[in-house]
């Protein structure tokens, strides 16, 4: 009897999960990802914020930049010129979209201890990078791009037709940022920086989304944003590249579109330097099943850029989209030629192919009935991957080593073995050549980074093992996971269950089904965290299961292509049967089922709480999608082509959640909305909200005046805890 | 000492078949890809086409696709050349040829036979 | 691809340089090999890569080019050099050879 009453006393010191911890993130782990500056050299702001040089092979660091400077500016970010001779200093941070921010810019010198004076910057700047080696300085400042040789000489302006909200130079407008190229930039240097690459955006035919922006004003701001809905006109996209050594002398040249892209609408989806006079363009269709690869070079006697019919390399999809979220990026050899990139194989798994004359010829590098995620880095013998082969689970990622300096090429998994319960989940950060790398390990226990040896894979240190976290988890009831999957009409349901920390099987629980279920999503990944939901297991008592289905990736095409054309249809279905499966484990109240999703997710709750199923007693909307001729063109028409007769309007018309108002008269239904929400406009749920009444339906709604589509800030806590709240009334739990 | 060695050369009719053999030895021929080539009498070379190691991949010279077929025994370290449908312009010194591979994916032809002779006349 | 190689045949003697070439009707991107054929013999790989010589390959050889164009070098000839050159791409299937050229002694 004495381990059982040991064992009490200890359960009866560890104490519950708390809102008030998941919203000071009491709970949150920290990663450790090296700013690789050589093959063996890294930069990392130390915890007194000191900028720190550390040497892997001679074991020494030194500070390049005290704390003291940083904060002379206020500066939030660096960033060194390869040569070595200058940090950029990053301030005045403002945030624009999900990745776009503008900034001031401060240039110190290192060789004298100077901030560089004269032919200061202007400000605030939109983007600005260094030449990958030297230090030229590329940046976009109101749309325009500009040059410096030297960071104290004066600008040389490359382009003249920048124009906010119309033409934008070197960055991409809000559907490019958000949909195609998800950064903040739109320029690369060549590897030298011989030349530079850039995208012009030319907004001119776009509709403007308008929504208010109250503030403290009298007159609230009106936000206005070119913003192709769905069948709306696009971007107009153009790529130029100029001789940044001579800027002037030709001047930006216009790298040519494929015949076959450039007959219709079409998008720039990525550009990869190969060498200083060879680059790579891929191109889309707006039709989204159609990509290019076009390998262009530079002609020295005219100096134009060629991109012959033989170095086009078409990716076509036959049964749904091109490519996964996102059409793949190659990674090249060291032939400069051909290249490695992951793409659909004919069983309709994504793996890595090798490509070198044409992709018909492609070599198969990785087979199986699982997928090839990412390819890190290429050296000549070894391919760097990640995948979610080992033990076949979808929701793991590991980093796996093909030896292709010889034959047949050999398979390592790095990480599989290393720290197998805790680490399941990894991603990789590479110095140049390989010559070392970091590894991120995101759990399922508790976060881990470390530093390994590129040719023997030796761990040499560990970089960040949040001993803090650890610790303060040890008094803490954490609830129990487990990710399992359920087999129904051929096809695998792959699902996460958080319960309470003393589950018992015998008892009934109140359940929260968690979805997000957009396309080429994963939700049920072998990760670490301490959240919401894990609060709600842990101190309320509820079961909390989140499912991956049709649409989902990494497990196939069949899964992931199944929603083409279809959004709003099987992603519903398959969360219904899910909690149809769960019902029939025993432990859950069937009277007691609510479903919540934010975005993509807020629109599969919303339909699954309308699908007359009467499984659900009430369910949350977090900034749903309402109709898809609301959502973005680059997005919705991927999935669903486009809105007219001859194509989709059927299902645009069929799949919005204002047809099933009526259905939610017999659900608790709360939806939340901020009302400056850029990217799912609060448009609607205004739209839901006008429907419901309309069907005079009772609902609850919350709305966030000037939050976007992140609630963030003081919002966030008002959220969680008005979730919590109606949460606990629909459970019928104590306050 | 790497040896590959053909044989099954000789006098065949036009339209008739016939089976040339390449046997390897002093490497290892399962990790080898493997080609064979031709050389009209006083001509050139001709490239006929190839197999990778575990016979996954095969190509041909166009030309030849429907006529000749390569394939070979990894367990008895030899390769084949299955003609038929032969006419006079096949007579020639037929040789096989195996080679390293090279970063990035493709193989040269170091290792050669001494080469096999069929002659096609009726 | 076509491969055309030139001259078709050539006179040189012993401790001249001599260069051969190799033009290829479409970008092969350096996948080219050159080997040596002496009467009676099969042939030698001594080139791959357009530049990288194969082993034992003495260094008098060179081979150079990019694209389209692309040379063999001969340095000082010696009296085993005299024989047949051919050229042969790698790019893609078939992998044709040159026409060859015949490198006599003068």
């Known amino acids: 009897l004495r381990p059982s009453r040991v064992h009490n006393s200890e359960e009866n010191t560890m104490r519950a999960l708390t809102l008030k911890d998941i919203l000071n993130g009491t709970f949150s782990y920290k990663t450790f990802f090296p700013n690789w500056i050589s093959g063996q050299e890294y930069l990392h702001q130390s915890a007194d914020n000191n900028i720190v040089l550390y040497n892997i092979e001679t074991g020494q660091s030194y500070t390049i930049l005290s704390n003291r400077t940083m904060k002379s500016v206020n500066a939030s970010n660096y960033g060194l010129s390869p040569d070595r001779q200058f940090v950029y200093l990053e301030s005045d941070y403002s945030k624009l979209w999900r990745y776009s921010y503008t900034a001031t810019y401060y240039i110190y010198d290192l060789s004298n201890g100077e901030f560089v004076r004269g032919n200061e910057l202007p400000r605030p700047i939109q983007y600005l990078c260094w030449s990958p080696v030297g230090s030229k300085l590329a940046y976009v400042y109101q749309n325009n791009i500009y040059l410096k040789q030297r960071p104290g000489d004066p600008p040389f302006q490359i382009t003249f037709n920048g124009r906010e909200n119309k033409i934008f130079n070197g960055i991409p407008d809000w559907v490019y940022e958000e949909e195609m190229l998800a950064t903040k930039y739109a320029l690369w240097w060549s590897p030298n920086g011989k030349f530079l690459a850039y995208a012009e955006f030319n907004d001119t035919d776009i509709p403007v989304i308008a929504y208010s922006y109250y503030g403290d004003e009298q007159y609230p701001r009106t936000i206005n944003i070119p913003y192709p809905k769905a069948g709306a006109k696009n971007p107009v996209v153009r790529i130029f590249i100029i001789d940044t050594t001579y800027p002037a002398y030709v001047g930006p040249q216009e790298v040519p579109v494929p015949a076959m892209i450039a007959s219709s609408d079409y998008y720039f989806s990525w550009l990869t330097w190969v060498t200083d006079e060879r680059v790579c363009l891929q191109w889309l269709k707006r039709v989204q099943n159609v990509s290019v690869l076009s390998i262009c070079d530079f002609r020295e006697d005219w100096q134009t850029w060629d991109c012959p019919k033989t170095q086009e390399h078409i990716e076509e999809s036959r049964t749904g989209w091109a490519g996964g979220f996102f059409v793949s990026t190659p990674v090249f050899s060291y032939d400069a030629i051909s290249y490695y990139k992951i793409f659909s194989d004919k069983d309709g798994y994504k793996h890595i192919h090798y490509i070198k004359d044409t992709v018909e010829n492609a070599i198969q590098i990785t087979s199986g009935k699982w997928e090839a995620i990412n390819i890190f880095r290429v050296t000549q013998d070894s391919l760097f991957y990640s995948s979610n082969e080992f033990e076949e689970y979808p929701g793991r990622r590991n980093i796996y080593r093909i030896s292709i300096g010889s034959y047949p090429p050999s398979k390592k998994c790095v990480t599989c073995h290393l720290r197998k319960e805790r680490c399941q989940y990894y991603t990789a950060s590479f110095s140049d050549y390989a010559k070392y790398y970091a590894l991120v390990c995101y759990g399922p226990g508790i976060p881990i980074s470390t530093l390994h040896d590129g040719r023997t894979d030796q761990e040499i240190k560990i970089l960040e093992e949040n001993k803090e976290l650890e610790n303060a988890l040890k008094n803490i009831q954490l609830p129990k996971e487990e990710i399992k999957k359920l087999e129904v009409d051929e096809i695998t349901l792959w699902y996460k269950m958080i319960l309470p920390p003393q589950f018992d099987r015998s008892k009934k629980y109140p359940l929260l089904i968690q979805v997000y279920g957009g396309p080429c999503s994963q939700s049920v990944r072998s990760v670490f965290a301490v959240n919401w939901i894990s609060y709600l297991a842990s101190k309320e008592g509820m079961v909390i299961a989140l499912v991956d289905g049709r649409g989902t990736a990494f497990q196939g095409d069949k899964l992931l292509y199944a929603v083409y054309r279809k959004l709003g249809v099987y992603e519903v279905e398959d969360q219904i049967t899910a909690v149809r499966k769960f019902i029939e484990m025993g432990f859950i109240d069937e009277k007691r089922i609510a479903i919540w999703g934010w975005s993509y997710g807020g629109y599969v709750s919303s339909l699954a709480l309308a699908s007359g199923t009467g499984l659900f007693k009430c369910g949350i909307a977090v900034a749903p999608v309402s109709s898809w001729e609301y959502y973005a063109s680059v997005y919705t028409e991927r999935f669903m082509g486009l809105p007219t007769k001859d194509d989709n309007l059927e299902h645009y018309k069929n799949s919005t959640v204002m047809a099933r108002a009526e259905y939610f008269r017999n659900v608790d239904y709360l939806l939340i909305h901020g009302t400056a929400d850029d990217n799912v406009h609060f448009q609607n749920s205004a739209q839901i909200a006008k429907a419901l009444v309309n069907a005079q339906v009772d609902f609850q709604a919350m709305w966030y005046s000037d939050q976007n589509h992140g609630l963030s800030g003081l919002s966030t806590n008002h959220l969680y805890t008005h979730m919590t709240h109606f949460l606990k009334q629909c459970f019928s739990l104590s306050d | 000492e790497v040896q590959l060695l053909e044989s099954g050369g000789g006098l065949v009719q036009p339209g008739g078949s016939l089976k040339l053999s390449c046997a390897a030895s002093g490497f290892d021929f399962s990790r080898y890809w493997m080609s064979w080539v031709r050389q009209a009498p006083g001509k050139g070379l001709e490239w006929i086409g190839e197999i990778n190691p575990d016979s996954s991949t095969i190509n041909y010279t166009p030309s030849l696709k429907d006529k000749f077929i390569i394939s070979r025994d990894n367990a008895k370290n030899t390769l084949y050349l299955q003609m038929s449908k032969v006419r006079s312009e096949d007579t020639a010194l037929y040789y096989c040829?195996?080679?390293?591979?090279?970063?990035?994916?493709?193989?040269?032809?170091?290792?050669w036979g001494q080469g096999t002779t069929v002659t096609v006349s009726s | 691809l076509v491969m055309t190689q030139s001259p078709a045949s050539l006179s040189a003697s012993v401790g001249e340089t001599v260069t051969i070439t190799c033009r290829a009707s479409?970008?092969?991107?350096?996948?080219l090999a050159w080997y040596q054929q002496k009467q009676g013999k099969s042939p030698q790989l001594l080139v791959y890569?357009?530049?990288t010589l194969a082993d034992g390959v003495p260094s008098r050889f060179s081979g150079s080019g990019s694209g389209t164009q692309y040379s063999l070098k001969i340095n000082s000839l010696q009296p085993e050099d005299f024989g047949s050159y051919y050229c042969?791409?790698?790019?893609?299937?078939?992998?044709?050879f040159g026409g060859g050229t015949k490198l006599e002694i003068k």
């Open positions: 042969q791409h790698f790019w893609s299937t078939p992998y044709t």
């Open positions: 890569n357009a530049k």
């Open positions: 479409g970008n092969i991107h350096n996948y």
């Open positions: 040829a195996g080679g390293y591979y090279r970063y990035p994916y493709y193989y040269t032809m170091d290792y």
